[in-house]
């Protein structure tokens, strides 16, 4: 039975050229996290964090994606094309799979606010 919940940074905005932290947090379960996958809006895989074998970043994003903090992901040198949905998928044992959603809006404006509040999707 899946008792856990995924909390995410929800809907966030950040400045073009800046950076942003995508963060998911699994709570209310004792399940062991075996792997976390981070996917982009077109469902392409950005990064994997395997519990035994560490972080793996998609080659095209190596210069712009940094692992962490924790199981999160930092996107750097943001472009307007980075606007869209991001998904964290937590593979756990024995619970199974949990999935969280974050919407990132990249703004041209210099007054872009980077909100980092946690919310349950």
């Amino acid at each position: 039975m899946m008792t856990g919940t995924i909390e995410t940074t929800g809907n966030i905005s950040a400045k073009k050229g800046g950076s942003v932290i995508l963060q998911c947090h699994l709570s209310s379960t004792m399940a062991q996290v075996t792997q976390v996958n981070w996917e982009q809006h077109d469902h392409s895989l950005l990064a994997i964090r395997n519990a035994e074998l560490g972080w793996h970043i998609y080659p095209a994003f190596k210069d712009r994606v940094a692992p962490g903090p924790g199981l999160g992901l930092t996107l750097q040198s943001l472009t307007m094309n980075d606007t869209g949905e991001y998904f964290c998928t937590y593979h756990t044992y024995p619970d199974g799979t949990y999935r969280g959603r974050i919407f990132l809006e990249v703004l041209e404006s210099s007054v872009a606010e980077h909100s980092a509040r946690f919310q349950i999707p």
Epitope: T34, Q35, N37, N50, H56, Y58, T97
Partner: antibody, heavy 117, light 106 residues
């Protein structure tokens, strides 16, 4: 052309150690992690661990954590895998492979390690 | 981790035959599936990545498809150099391989 060339076959006695080398060429050695895998007779390929040549950081599958040692010599673009306390079940073909993101794009030719008394 | 089961384990075929190999996951693989070819005493060779993307330099007679838990590798017209063992590999949850399918000459 990317190439990974491994050292030759080894025969070892139970309890001994073996060290296998993997010489990389055709790309910048520090830009890709090297994985070590093995295939025992009649068994599927299994991962032993990973080393990042850029910083020497290693990762191991739990099964091999206490017996495997991974190192690199970046000046020679060579990775090494040492397995200690050998037993007959360690008889296998050992492979090094380069990982490109999430999958292995180039492999060594394999090194047969036979453990026999 | 996801367990992968290939079928068949052995396959006898003739040059020119259309050959299909199946790889089934114990859980959803999410299209994060790769196919390798290996000949005796040689390094495995990457054929297809992300379910259906042909690796550079691989002949177009090789193709991949699938979704969810079921994936297939198809060789449209088997050539003499295609007699080998084929492995699937997934990275959606863990990094695991199928047991292999040996394609032999009939």
């Amino acid at each position: 052309e990317v190439q990974l060339v491994q050292s030759g076959a080894e025969v070892k006695k139970p309890g001994a150690s073996v060290k296998v080398s993997c010489k990389a060429s055709g790309y910048t050695f520090t830009e890709h992690s090297i994985y070590w895998l093995r295939q025992a007779p009649g068994q599927r390929l299994e991962i032993i661990g990973r080393i990042d040549p850029k910083n020497g950081r290693t990762y191991f599958v739990d099964k091999f954590k206490n017996r495997a040692t991974l190192t690199t010599d970046t000046s020679a673009s060579t990775a090494y895998m040492e397995l200690s306390s050998l037993r007959s079940e360690d008889t296998a073909v050992y492979f090094c492979a380069r990982i490109d993101g999430f999958y292995f794009d180039f492999w060594g030719q394999g090194t047969l390690v036979t453990v026999s008394s | 981790d996801i367990q992968l089961t290939q079928s068949p384990s052995f396959l006898s075929a003739s040059v020119g035959d259309r050959v299909t190999i199946t790889c089934k996951g114990s859980q959803n693989v999410n299209k994060y599936l790769v196919w390798y070819q290996q000949k005796p005493g040689k390094a495995p060779k990457l054929l297809i990545y992300s379910t259906d993307n042909l690796q550079s330099g691989i002949p177009s007679r090789f193709s991949g498809s699938g979704s969810g838990t079921e994936y297939t590798l198809t060789i449209s017209s088997l050539q003499p150099e295609d007699f080998a063992t084929y492995y699937c590999y997934q990275y959606n949850n863990g990094f695991t391989f199928g047991q292999g399918t040996k394609v032999e000459i009939k």
